[in-house]
Amino acid sequence: MMTGTIETTGNISAEKGGSIILQCHLSSTTAQVTQVNWEQQDQLLAICNADLGWHISPSFKDRVAPGPGLGLTLQSLTVNDTGEYFCIYHTYPDGTYTGRIFLEVLESSVAEHGARFQIP
């Protein structure tokens, strides 16, 4: 039975040219995290494997940095980065947990962080 929940940074906004940290946290489970995948609309951004460490997709190497923790840092943001991001936690024995973050990249300097929310 899957008892865990994923807490994410929720709906967030950031300025064009700036950077943002995408973070998810898995709680309420003792399951072992074997791998975390970060994806944007079915496109792989990065993988953090418990044994093999971090891997950033070649097409994002210049603008994506691993961490902090199991999170992901997006740099040199463009308006095209606006959209949904998913953290996919592969765990044993529970299975897969998915968290969703919506990022809006703004032209102006009016960029505020949204509230945190949970996905069971």
Epitope: E39, D42, N49, L52, G53, P58, T96
Partner: antibody, heavy 122, light 107 residues
């Protein structure tokens, strides 16, 4: 050209260990992950584990955990797979295989060694 | 571990036939699926990676499709050199498990 050359056939007794080598040439050795895959006679392919030749990090299939050790020697561009406590069921052809893309998650294996036959028999 | 199930385990076909092999994963693997061809006494050969991308040098009669849990390898017009065993493999999560194989034989 890109090539993986494995060591020769081995015959071992049950309980012994075997160390198979895989020498890479024709590419930047540390940029590509290397997997080990085995195939028992008349059976399918079985993934054993993977090593990152750059840092030496490894991931092993649970079935082989505690019995298998994968290492590399960057000075000779060689990876090694050692399997201990051999039993008759370990009789198989052992292949090393290179990940198809450099410095990235190992999507598929595009270059394979010729295979090393390991026979375990008393 | 992710289980990969191939079907059929064997099939008989004639030169020129269209051949379809399926592979099912026990959980979603997105597009992290590879197909290999193996001939007796030889090492496997990568045909398709990332579910549908053709490996360099592989004839265009081979194609792959699918996403999630269900995948297909299609040979549009079977050639004499295509009689072999085909394996799928997932590369989403370690261990990178293989399917049991499909042997394509001459009818």
């Amino acid at each position: 050209q890109v090539q993986l050359v494995q060591s020769g056939a081995e015959v071992k007794k049950p309980g012994a260990s075997v160390k198979v080598s895989c020498k890479a040439s024709g590419y930047t050795f540390t940029s590509y992950y290397m997997s080990w895959v085995r195939q028992a006679p008349g059976q399918g392919l079985e993934w054993m584990g993977i090593i990152n030749p750059s840092g030496g990090s490894t991931s092993y299939a649970q079935k082989f955990q505690g019995r298998v050790t994968m290492t590399r020697d960057t000075s000779t561009s060689t990876v090694y797979m050692e399997l201990s406590s051999l039993r008759s069921e370990d009789t198989a052809v052992y292949y090393c295989a290179r990940a198809r893309y450099p410095s990235s998650w190992p999507y598929g294996m595009d270059v394979w060694g010729q295979g090393t036959t390991v026979t375990v028999s008393s | 571990d992710i289980q990969m199930t191939q079907s059929p385990s064997s099939l008989s076909a004639s030169v020129g036939d269209r051949v379809t092999i399926t592979c099912r994963a026990s959980q979603s693997i997105n597009s992290y699926l590879n197909w290999y061809q193996q001939k007796p006494g030889k090492a496997p050969k990568l045909l398709i990676y990332a579910a549908s991308s053709l490996q360099s040098g592989v004839p265009s009669r081979f194609s792959g499709s699918g996403s999630g849990t269900d995948f297909t390898l299609t040979i549009s017009s079977l050639q004499p050199e295509d009689f072999a065993t085909y394996y799928c493999q997932q590369s989403l999560l370690t261990p990178f498990t293989f399917g049991g194989g499909t042997k394509v034989e001459i009818k």
